[in-house]
Interface confidence: low
Amino acid sequence: KKVVLGKKGDTVELTCTASQKKSIQFHWKNSNQIKILGNQGSFLTKGPSKLNDRADSRRSLWDQGNFPLIIKNLKIEDSDTYICEVEDQKEEVQLLVFGLTANSDTHLLQGQSLTLTLESPPGSSPSVQCRSPRGKNIQGGKTLSVSQLELQDSGTWTCTVLQNQKKVEFKIDIVVLAFQKASSIVYKKEGEQVEFSFPLAFTVEKLTGSGELWWQAERASSSKSWITFDLKNKEVSVKRVTQDPKLQMGKKLPLHLTLPQALPQYAGSGNLTLALEAKTGKLHQEVNLVVMRATQLQKNLTCEVWGPTSPKLMLSLKLENKEAKVSKREKAVWVLNPEAGMWQCLLSDSGQVLLESNIKVLPTWSTPVQP
């Protein structure tokens, strides 16, 4: 018996071939011997089956001795053995219809779980193998779960259903709702304007929700809310903002925040959360601010950084075009009685300069000038 696999909602064509290459009488019946369709001369006749309005054939093929049964908009309950009667012969075809759906919305937040459920006819024992867009192979039975979705799981999931050495392939588009970056770090000299950007890793027609930026300053004992905002059809409106610092926010996506000036008391870590309408859970992006200050007080030239720096970062003080006078894995370095000239304070990671601040040391009879 021939086995054909079909997909729920699709169209299937079951073949039936006569040895004579001409139009002769044929009938398609189901396992209960109820006539589905057949012919009377060159006319298509239909029986009383449930498939009535969804069953068809191709008259153009009858003259070649081919009498297909076409079933449109397949349903799981169409799974059955179909019998073609032609030339005193009976050809049996077993049709198995499967459906695969994401049993939740196909737009899921990063970290959430995706469950794919297979609808299958009674008596079948299919196996399912799905491949995520990042090439991850997942196998399962009637249900298949993937926990902790990552950004790389966005895209088309290709699932193969195997039954009786036959296979049928499903494609499901999954959108993982997340920020493009889980974390970012901004390095600024004291007094500079700070730009924070929070680009989303997905695009949807309408985006509505609300968000908030909580900030934990390095010098503060507790975190505080710097800004809250609403998002309506990709338009941003600020609800509440602290007076210190007074952040400004862009009115359109991507989410964009401006801190008028970088000050040591603002250095620290922030967490931007975005709650989307009709979604449980929130999107998160961490943002870090490192602030540098170079000062000269009396005979002491000091360079300091505030904020979440890695222990491997190097802080150096050097006179322009000369070797570093002092270089330490510390958050503050200083030089006593510095020579006159342009001094550079450098924060670097494996030789790559992340932040630089220059300070001019004048002869001892002058006062310092900070560019």
Epitope: Q129, R131, R134, G135, K136, N137, I138, Q139, G140, S145, V146, S147, Q148, E150, Q152
Partner: antibody, heavy 118, light 108 residues
Framework: EVQVVESGGGLVQPGGSLRLSCAAS????????MHWVRQATGKGLEWVST???????YYPGSVKGRFTISRENAKNSLYLQMNSLRAGDTAVYYC????????????WGQGTTVTVSS | EIVLTQSPGTLSLSPGERATLSCRAS???????LAWYQQKPGQSPRLLIH???SRATGIPDRVSGSGSGTDFTLTISRLEPEDFAVYYC?????????FGPGTKVDIK
């Protein structure tokens, strides 16, 4: 430095049990598939088990029902519980990390030796 | 089970020569799921190629992979002394994720 280090190998009698451990460091352990692969002296590589990030587990027929792979993400640790051991299980057992964006074992340990003998 | 067959079993070549190693699968394997490894005596295996043709980090461009379906090839354009080793292919198309028996490349 990204690395995996196996431990727990040793001499065990046929029918006995052994638990291998693999300590991972230098990467976000929970985000990667992890594998056990073995190699008998002078022979080729044989895949033993895989655990996915979702906790999904895979085994070849030769060890199915006898070996159990598990992971403890909080401890950055991978385990292989081996029961009903046979002489044919004697080998060097390697722990390996699966690629993040692709299929392939991109980080391997030095291996731990398991000897099943009476 | 997908069975991988590697040929030849041993390849005897001189430094500077081109090495062509074959890996044949008993049934079709998506190229995304084929990897190649190198193993030297007393050492752990090392990933060379993933996705049939993508070089792993740090692998020189004299090493390349190709193929699709059931036939895959690993090519080393000019053999260097450090390339003499055993090479294995592995498939992830379906569980069990089998390895080939290996091809030994030794000095002529």
């Amino acid at each position: 430095e990204v690395q995996v280090v196996e431990s727990g190998g040793g001499l065990v009698q046929p029918g006995g049990s052994l638990r291998l451990s693999c300590a991972a460091s230098g990467f976000t352990f929970s985000s990667y598939d992890m594998h056990w692969v073995r190699q008998a002296t002078g022979k080729g590589l044989e895949w033993v088990s895989t655990i996915g990030t979702a906790g999904d587990t895979y085994y070849p027929g030769s060890v199915k029902g006898r070996f159990t792979i598990s992971r403890e993400n909080a401890k950055n640790s991978l385990y292989l519980q081996m029961n009903s051991l046979r002489a044919g299980d004697t080998a060097v057992y390697y722990c390996a990390r699966g690629g993040y964006y692709y299929y392939g074992m991109d980080v391997w340990g030095q291996g731990t030796t398991v000897t099943v003998s009476s | 089970e997908i069975v991988l067959t590697q040929s030849p079993g041993t390849l005897s070549l001189s430094p500077g020569e081109r090495a062509t190693l074959s890996c044949r699968a008993s049934q079709s394997v998506s190229s995304s799921y084929l990897a190649w490894y190198q193993q030297k005596p007393g050492q752990s295996p090392r990933l060379l190629i993933h996705g049939a043709s993508s070089r792993a980090t740090g692998i020189p461009d004299r090493v390349s992979g190709s193929g699709s379906g059931t036939d895959f090839t690993l090519t080393i354009s000019r053999l260097e002394p450090e390339d003499f080793a055993v090479y294995y292919c592995q498939q992830y198309g379906s569980s069990p994720f089998t390895f080939g028996p290996g091809t030994k490349v030794d000095i002529k």
